[in-house]
């Protein structure tokens, strides 16, 4: 799903307050709901009719440092006999997510949000005929 | 996929630098790669064998303000005849993502990262038998 552009108003103080210095804001350390965890069924990536593999990317100047990307294993979907059925398509499910980027110049450290596209998994879809207008 | 706990070191300056004031850091405004967009196949939520609906939640003090959650339409999966096949299971695919929470006390505005669980879509899986030990 798409993340809309960040409105200028989001970083502004209420109208009755003195304006904020341009360019940076105060970021509290710590994460709200940090202990919240996914409660997904196990091994769905291998049990799915549109199975996928995971690839991990690592960046120490990003939080989270580890970002996991899924890749569909097949073009078609796996049928009841365990064979690839190409009358159906395995397609990736993508999500726009935010990460926190750490930037330093000498002893000056600042942070900035970064949008990352994550392929979360795959689903099996029925293809449709492209009807030429 | 799980987001690990934010290490205390992530918010720290290099060792040779004077320590950071406890509790807050500098957040640059603007988003890196803000114009990046998902390039998913269209209408996959209705064409999937494990179709889903979307629900939008809205919070003006969160960026993004709009967070979209998927809910699987069926317990089973849709077969070639368009009927629900309960020998297979529609299961949600979840993703831990970050949002930016805006907090104000009077004219003081600060921001904090918040972890949110997003159900991105659904996939069709083969159920497994639970073998009792």
């Amino acid at each position: 799903r798409k993340i809309p552009k960040v409105g200028h108003t989001f970083f502004q103080k209420p109208e009755s307050c003195p304006p904020v210095p341009e360019g940076s804001m105060k970021l509290d350390t710590g994460i709200i709901n940090e202990n919240q965890r996914v409660s997904m069924s196990r091994n769905i990536e291998s049990r799915s009719t549109s199975p996928w593999n995971y690839t991990v990317t690592w960046d120490p100047n990003r939080y989270p440092s580890e970002v996991v990307q899924a890749q569909c294993k097949h073009l078609g979907c796996i049928n009841a006999q365990g064979k690839e059925d190409i009358s159906m398509n395995s397609v990736p499910i993508q999500q726009e997510t935010l990460v926190l980027r750490r930037k330093h110049q000498g002893c000056s450290v600042s942070f900035q949000l970064e949008k990352v596209l994550v392929t979360v998994g795959c689903t099996c879809v029925t293809p449709v005929v492209h009807h030429v207008q | 996929r799980k987001i690990p706990k934010v290490g205390h070191t992530f918010f720290q300056k290099p060792e040779s630098c004077p320590p950071v004031p406890e509790g807050s850091m500098k957040l640059d405004t603007g988003i890196i790669n803000e114009n990046q967009r998902v390039s998913m196949s269209r209408n996959i939520e209705s064409r999937s064998t494990s179709p889903w609906n979307y629900t939008v939640t809205w919070d003006p003090n969160r960026y993004p303000s709009e967070v979209v959650q998927a809910q699987c339409k069926h317990l089973g999966c849709i077969n070639a005849q368009g009927k629900e096949d309960i020998s297979m299971n529609s299961v949600p695919i979840q993703q831990e993502t970050l949002v930016l929470r805006r907090k104000h006390q009077g004219c003081s505005v600060s921001f904090q990262l918040e972890k949110v669980l997003v159900t991105v879509g659904c996939t069709c899986v083969t159920p497994v038998v639970h073998h009792v030990q």
């Epitope: 569909c72 097949h74 073009l75 078609g76 064979k83 690839e84 059925d85 190409i86 009358s87 398509n89 395995s90 397609v91 990736p92 879809v125 293809p127 449709v128 005929v129 492209h130 009807h131 030429v132 | 390039s39 196949s41 269209r42 209408n43 070639a80």
Partner: antibody
């Protein structure tokens, strides 16, 4: 006019490489998956490779896997086939074909074909 | 791998006659079978997809039928431009897009 025009064929020695191109016009290129299909002289049709709209899905026939690479440049409305380690049995007329699937996905039927470009592998 | 066998290899008929071409699959391809026409020196042209659906611009004299392993392409009344080679193709199982060996429809 809606058309596909292949180029890049020619005479090449076994073991060498060749790159085929297909220029698409008259339609929105990235709305479609695309394929290469070949036909040896006097023989039938053989699917070689296919690629979906955003290059996220790619497939190859076993006979060319590991030797041929399909790619596309949506900004240039072009499809490519990089052919390495060519063999005599790769000699054929190579057609560029448009998939009839909607949303740039595979349907595995071919609704529009080019005229083909001839690849001859011989010493 | 699914093998598609077309018969007869050659069909000799006169204009105005009915042509019946057969395609047999080595295992079920359900209804996921297409037919193409190829004239000498030309690229193939899609006629029928998913066993019985006519492609855009294909005349009504062309019809397809069958499911599972046995399929038929019928040309109700041959026109001079219909003399060509016809190929069937499946889109059911990997490897995709396997074609039959072709049936040549020639003028008697």
């Amino acid at each position: 006019e809606v058309q596909l025009v292949e180029s890049g064929g020619g005479l090449v020695q076994p073991g060498r490489s060749l790159r085929l191109s297909c220029a698409a016009s008259g339609f929105t290129f990235d709305d479609y998956a695309m394929h290469w299909v070949r036909q040896a002289p006097g023989k039938g049709l053989e699917w070689v490779s296919g690629i979906n709209w955003n290059s996220g899905g790619i497939g190859y026939a076993d006979s060319v896997k590991g030797r041929f690479t399909i790619s596309r440049d949506n900004a240039k409305n072009s499809l490519y086939l990089q052919m390495n380690s060519l063999r005599a049995e790769d000699t054929a007329l190579y057609y560029c074909a448009r998939d009839m699937g909607g949303f740039g996905e595979f349907y595995w039927n071919f609704g529009l074909w080019g005229r083909g470009t001839l690849v001859t592998v011989s010493s | 791998e699914i093998v598609l066998t077309q018969s007869p290899a050659t069909l000799s008929l006169s204009p105005g006659e009915r042509a019946t071409l057969s395609c047999r699959a080595s295992q079920s391809v359900r209804s996921y079978l297409a037919w193409y026409q190829q004239k000498p020196g030309q690229a193939p042209r899609l006629l029928i997809y998913d066993a019985s659906n006519r492609a855009t611009g294909i005349p009504a004299r062309f019809s397809g039928s069958g499911s599972g392993t046995d399929f038929t392409l019928t040309i109700s009344s041959l026109e001079p431009e219909d003399f060509a080679v016809y190929y069937c193709q499946q889109r059911s199982n990997w490897p995709p897009a396997t074609f039959g060996g072709g049936t040549k429809v020639e003028i008697k």
